[in-house]
Each structure stands twice: as structure tokens, then as C-alpha cells.
């Protein structure tokens, strides 16, 4: 008689990220017995939907459906059957849909009750879709890449996990950038969160950790490009726009009413003499990152010190993850590598936007053009962001690390999400911890 | 399409306690919350309270507290309003109302048809 | 707790006329938490206007509302037979309270 396996003794959650240009799926895995141990769970999936964000299908919800089908089926496949009905699917909508929120609250109902009664068709325990907070994303984010580093493990390790670790439990901060919004969330060494809105206190296995963390809303890559132009526009001549921020000799139309549609763009916003103008590459770092720091207004703040816009930001402390948008534009520019310091990304960048559109074509034929013609702009941006926005220094930027996965899992705001409404973060330290290997992509 | 439907008139004597249903149908229950709001014969709106169907929390007006108690069951999709030491004042129809989302604003989208509650000896 | 005083009591206009309901709140009240009501004799209260200014789904473009801090208008602008009832307003600010309502009676 042959050995028969016995069931594979786990458990599956599903996690829709519902970002402001795309939507993805997750599927997390974890053993049954160890559900509070920490680093058990990883994703065994991730599958992207084909398409926009969920905000813009505010004309033409009779779409959604169909729109989630490909993944919902894949998660179907990947999960078995006989845990169909025990595995929770959570929908995180992020700021594309803040932003659809504060245009008008009744039609971003309207996108998430088609969303909710979309994804209740399916056999899983579907628990509801809903906007989370800017806050709640950075919170995830930074719970997500701790546990995925083992960092709220107590055990002690005979062996380092990262080659640039230090002090094992040193939490490591977060940093999130998307397409609408970006977060920054760390413990700050001794120093007190002048402002209320951007604490956050936990307990999580045994320890209490208090957090800072604040999200810029609009300050999300795409919609920084938007606020960019908009700000531009207003002292353009005529409709042509010299952008220094794409290649030269790229050449783009952009509708006014594009321009002017979403409420990042809303302080810019004026009566132009055109409705369309034409985007003129001219690929000049440097003018590309002092129209950039425009967006940042740093002459007013009523703490101690400020990022910028009048926001409290304590002095940075530790190392950092960079992850989502700040990892994909770096990984496609190849400045992920912990050797290459500030200064030699600056300089990368300058060649890069420099670069003739021409040319950038022919070098990323494999690349769909609106991404590519962003890449100046995003590197720029991120840049920026991170020196003038966050205040790292040339020798505080060793401490970013831009992380895409650990351990597999992708670092994002997810996986934290997950655990936190499964319950499977505990306050007090479990009796017993497992070794976890970390590594980072 | 939403509905909201509520359960059927009630008598009841002074100091007596009522309980009032509203099954909820047409989108996830556990998605938005629930008001009541009451109006006696001839008079204008006076809001009760507010449940939170996902978790149960509930929120009410100072006016009603120690004599209501809104409770949910999420697999009925039903919010249940129970007002207790009943006397003639509360003599009203009390209506259920969707409210807002998580992170919305509070305004009353969608009303049920509302009860008639008399409180006479 | 904030009071809302809606004036006039009642308004007494013929079809094809303009009405204008006033609603006073007894402190600021943000414009996004300020809503009106159309309520019918035996019906319940329909949502008009939310945020002070935004027409709920389905609301004819005849009815649009207005203000800010502690001032708010609901304007009817062509009145039909279907408009006559009682308006209420409604805020937010910790607690919901509503206005006493204005009646609009057929001259």
C-alpha cells in the first residue's frame, strides 16, 4: 500500500491592494498551529489586474467585475477547494480612492459597493472593501517589513540575517511611495511626537514601540507629476511646456481637464488660454529637481522641525526600507545596490535625463513608453523626496535600503494589514518563537 | 437596489421596553453604519444613535443613553433599536437610516419605512 | 450642542415659483457636514444635498444648496407640484442634529 501525505495542516488569507494605478492580489500562507508565531506567514502569490486603479472606473462600474475576474479565478486555482470557504479576502483601497472620496464620497460609495458585491460572488469569507487610512498604510508597511526581518522575534540568533545589521531588534523604518501618496513611518530615538496625528503606539510581541508616521497625500509619484505640471503651466508663455523633468525630444499632449481633474492640482488651478498644451522634453536634472522642490513648501512650520507643508518629522533614526514605487523606479534605473552612494545616484540621474528620448527608446524597446517617459521625472522625484522632503543626508542615505521582497513576501502595506484583522499579531510574546531566515530581494 | 426594512407597529404601556427590526439588503451589511432617527405626530426630526455593524460599537445621543441599545446580527443583516422605560413622549414613528462609510461624513443616504411605536396605558 | 434654525416655518409660493429655506447653525459648521431633507406626509425623509452643495443621486438639478460656517441655503429653483413638503437640514459635529423644518404649502 502506498504512503498517503497527510493534508497539508495551513491556512490562506487574501489581501486586494487597490492602489491609485493598479490593483493586486496577495496570497498569504502560513501554517495552522503557528499562527502567532512570527515570520510564519509569506506570500505564495501575487497577481496584478489587468488595468487602472478602482477610481477609474467611477463612469463604468459595470466593469469591475470583470475587471477582478482574472485574479479572483488564479486565487481560486492556488488556494484548495476545501479552504475556500475558511480563507478571508480583505480589499485595502488606498489614496487613488481618498482622492475619489473627496471629489465625491457617492461615487467612491458607488465603486465600492460594485467592488463589494463583486467580490462576494466568489467562495472565500469575503470580510468587505474599504479606504484606509494614510496612516494605516504606513503602520502596515512598517509592521509588515519588521516581521518579514524577524525584527519582533525575541529569540536571539547565532547568525546575522542581513549583512548590514547591527542590532537585531532595532526596528527598521518605512518608506512607501505610490502613485497618489507616499508614507514615512520609524521609532525616533528618545524623541517625543510633537503632534498627536502622527503617533501611533503598539505592543506587539512583549514590546511597545512608539511610532511616527505620516502620509502625504498627493505627494504619491504620479499625482507630484500632476501638482508639477499644473504648477509649470501657470507661467508657460504659450502651450508649449519646456519640461526639464523628460528626455529631450520627448513630445507629449495633455488635455487641461486632464490636468485639472484631480484635487492635487486644485491650488494651481487657473483659467488657461488653451485647452491642451504639449509636454517638451529638454532632460535637465538639475532645473528638474528645483521645479520639484516648488511642491515642497518648507518656509512654515509650527514644530521643531518639519518635512515640509507644516508636517512634524523628528530626526530620522536607524535604517529605512524603501519599498513600492521607491524600489520599481530604482530597480528599472539599477540604483538599488547598497554600494552606490548619494551622490553617484545624483550623478546617475543627470546622465539619464540627459539621454535623448530617441535613444532611451531604442535602449528599453521591452518598456511601454508612458512608463518610460516618466523614469526621469520618478528618479528625480524620489530624490528629492528623500534629501529635501525627508532631510536624509549623503551619509544617511546609506541607511535606505530599497527592498522589493523579504523572504519572498513583497514589502508593502499588505501583509501587515493581514495579520492585524486575522488577529495573528499578538501583544504579548508567545511562549515559543521559531528561527526565521530573513533575506531581502 | 438598497432596501431597508422595518418591522411592523407597535402598542406598548409606560415603562415598558420596545425592540424595532431593520433588515438591511442590496449591499455588505457590515459596510456602512446605521442610524435611528425618531419623529413624534407632527413634529421634526430627532436623531437617536448610530451602530457600527462590522464591530458592534455604538454611539448615542445624549438624550437616549441608559434607555437605548442598538445591536446588530450580521448574519441576518439586522440592527435592532431597544428603547426601554417607554412613557408617552416617546409616542413616534422610528426610522432606520444607512449612513456612511468608514471615513465618510455623516449624512442619513437611504431611510427605512419607518415603525409607528404608540406608548399608551 | 449645535442648534440649527431653519426659517422661515413656512413658505407659501405657487408652481413655477423660486423658494429659498434658510438654515442657521448656533455655531461653525463645516460645509462637508451639512445635509438637507425632503420629507412627504406618510413617507420617510429623502436625502437631497450633502456636503452643502452636492445633489444626492437621482435629485433634479431645480434644487441646489449653498453656504458656509453658519449660514446654508437650499434654493428650489422652478417648483414643481412633486416639490411641495417639509425641508429639513441636518449637520454633524460629534452628534447629528436637525433643523425644525420649513414647510412649502401651495399659495
Known amino acids: 500500500t502506498q504512503n498517503k501525505a497527510l493534508p497539508e495542516n495551513v491556512k490562506y488569507g487574501i489581501v486586494l491592494d487597490a492602489g491609485s494605478s493598479h490593483t493586486s492580489l496577495y496570497i498569504y500562507k502560513w501554517p495552522a498551529e503557528k499562527e502567532n508565531d512570527t515570520g510564519v506567514v509569506h506570500q505564495v502569490e501575487e497577481c496584478r489586474v489587468k488595468g487602472p486603479g478602482i477610481s477609474k472606473f467611477v463612469q463604468k462600474v459595470n466593469e469591475i467585475g470583470i475587471y477582478l475576474t482574472d485574479c479572483m479565478e488564479r486565487a481560486r486555482e492556488v488556494i484548495p477547494r476545501s479552504q475556500h470557504q475558511e480563507t478571508p479576502v480583505y480589499l485595502g483601497a488606498t489614496a487613488g480612492m481618498r482622492l475619489l472620496r473627496m471629489e465625491s464620497e457617492e461615487l467612491a460609495d458607488r465603486v465600492l459597493d460594485v467592488v463589494e458585491r463583486s467580490l462576494s460572488n466568489y467562495p472565500f469569507d469575503f470580510q468587505g472593501a474599504r479606504i484606509i487610512t494614510g496612516q494605516e498604510e504606513g503602520a502596515y508597511g512598517w509592521i509588515t517589513i519588521n516581521y518579514l526581518l524577524g525584527k519582533f522575534s525575541q529569540k536571539t540568533r547565532w547568525f546575522s540575517i542581513v549583512p548590514y545589521e547591527t542590532n537585531n531588534q532595532e526596528t527598521f523604518g518605512a518608506l512607501d511611495l505610490g502613485g497618489a501618496s507616499t508614507q514615512v513611518t520609524f521609532v525616533p530615538q528618545n524623541q517625543t511626537i510633537e503632534s498627536p496625528d502622527n503617533a501611533l503606539q503598539f505592543r506587539l510581541y512583549g514590546k511597545d514601540y512608539n511610532v511616527y508616521t505620516h502620509s502625504f497625500l498627493c505627494y504619491g509619484k504620479d499625482q507630484a507629476l500632476w501638482q508639477k505640471l499644473a504648477k509649470d503651466i501657470q507661467v508657460a508663455s504659450n502651450e508649449i511646456l519646456r519640461d526639464p523633468c523628460f528626455h529631450p525630444g520627448y513630445k507629449k499632449v495633455v488635455n487641461v481637464s486632464d490636468l485639472y481633474k484631480t484635487p492635487c492640482t486644485k491650488r494651481f488651478e487657473m483659467t488657461l488660454p488653451f485647452q491642451q498644451f504639449e509636454i517638451q522634453g529638454i532632460g535637465n536634472y538639475q532645473q528638474c529637481h528645483q521645479s520639484i522642490l516648488e511642491l515642497f513648501n518648507t518656509s512654515y512650520c509650527p514644530y521643531s522641525q518639519c518635512a515640509f507643508n507644516g508636517i512634524f518629522l523628528p530626526p530620522l533614526a536607524g535604517s529605512f526600507g524603501a519599498f513600492s514605487a521607491f524600489y520599481f523606479v530604482m530597480k528599472f534605473l539599477n540604483l538599488t545596490s547598497e554600494k552606490v552612494s548619494q551622490e553617484k545616484v545624483t550623478e546617475m540621474m543627470k546622465k539619464f535625463c540627459a539621454q535623448p528620448w530617441e535613444e532611451i527608446k531604442t535602449s528599453y524597446a521591452g518598456v511601454k513608453e508612458k512608463y518610460l517617459s516618466e523614469y526621469c521625472f520618478s528618479g528625480t522625484y524620489i530624490l528629492s523626496l528623500l534629501l529635501q522632503g525627508y532631510h536624509f543626508t549623503a551619509d544617511s542615505w546609506a541607511q535606505i535600503h530599497f527592498i522589493g521582497k523579504i523572504q519572498g513576501s513583497d514589502a508593502g502595506w499588505t501583509l501587515g494589514y493581514m495579520l492585524n484583522l486575522t488577529n495573528m499579531i499578538p501583544a504579548e510574546q508567545p511562549l515559543s518563537t521559531p528561527l526565521s531566515h530573513s533575506t531581502y530581494v | 437596489q438598497v432596501q431597508l426594512v422595518q418591522s411592523g407597529a407597535e402598542v406598548k404601556k409606560p415603562g415598558a421596553s420596545v425592540k424595532v427590526s431593520c433588515k438591511a439588503s442590496g449591499y455588505t451589511f457590515k459596510s456602512y453604519e446605521m442610524h435611528w432617527v425618531r419623529q413624534a405626530p407632527g413634529q421634526g426630526l430627532e436623531w437617536m444613535g448610530r451602530i457600527n455593524p462590522s464591530v458592534g460599537s455604538t454611539w448615542y445621543a445624549q438624550k437616549f443613553q441608559g434607555r437605548v441599545t442598538m445591536t446588530r446580527d450580521t448574519s441576518t443583516s439586522t440592527v435592532y433599536m431597544e428603547l426601554s422605560s417607554l412613557r408617552s413622549e416617546d409616542t413616534a414613528v422610528y426610522y432606520c437610516?444607512?449612513?456612511?462609510?468608514?471615513?465618510?461624513?455623516?449624512?442619513?443616504?437611504?431611510w427605512g419605512q419607518g415603525t409607528l411605536v404608540t406608548v399608551s396605558s | 450642542e449645535i442648534v440649527l434654525t431653519q426659517s422661515p416655518g413656512t413658505l407659501s409660493l405657487s408652481p413655477g415659483e423660486r423658494a429659498t429655506l434658510s438654515c442657521r447653525a448656533s455655531?461653525?459648521?463645516?460645509?462637508?457636514?451639512l445635509a438637507w431633507y425632503q420629507q412627504k406626509p406618510g413617507q420617510a425623509p429623502r436625502l437631497l444635498i450633502y456636503g452643502a452643495s452636492n445633489r444626492h443621486t437621482g435629485i433634479p438639478d431645480r434644487f441646489s444648496g449653498s453656504g458656509s460656517g453658519t449660514d446654508f441655503t437650499l434654493t428650489i429653483s422652478r417648483l414643481e407640484p412633486e416639490d411641495f413638503a417639509v425641508y429639513y437640514c441636518q449637520q454633524y459635529h460629534n452628534a447629528i442634529t436637525f433643523g425644525g423644518g420649513t414647510k412649502v404649502e401651495i399659495k
Open positions: 437610516a444607512r449612513g456612511k462609510r468608514e471615513g465618510g461624513t455623516e449624512y442619513l443616504r437611504k
Open positions: 455655531q461653525s459648521v463645516a460645509s462637508s457636514y
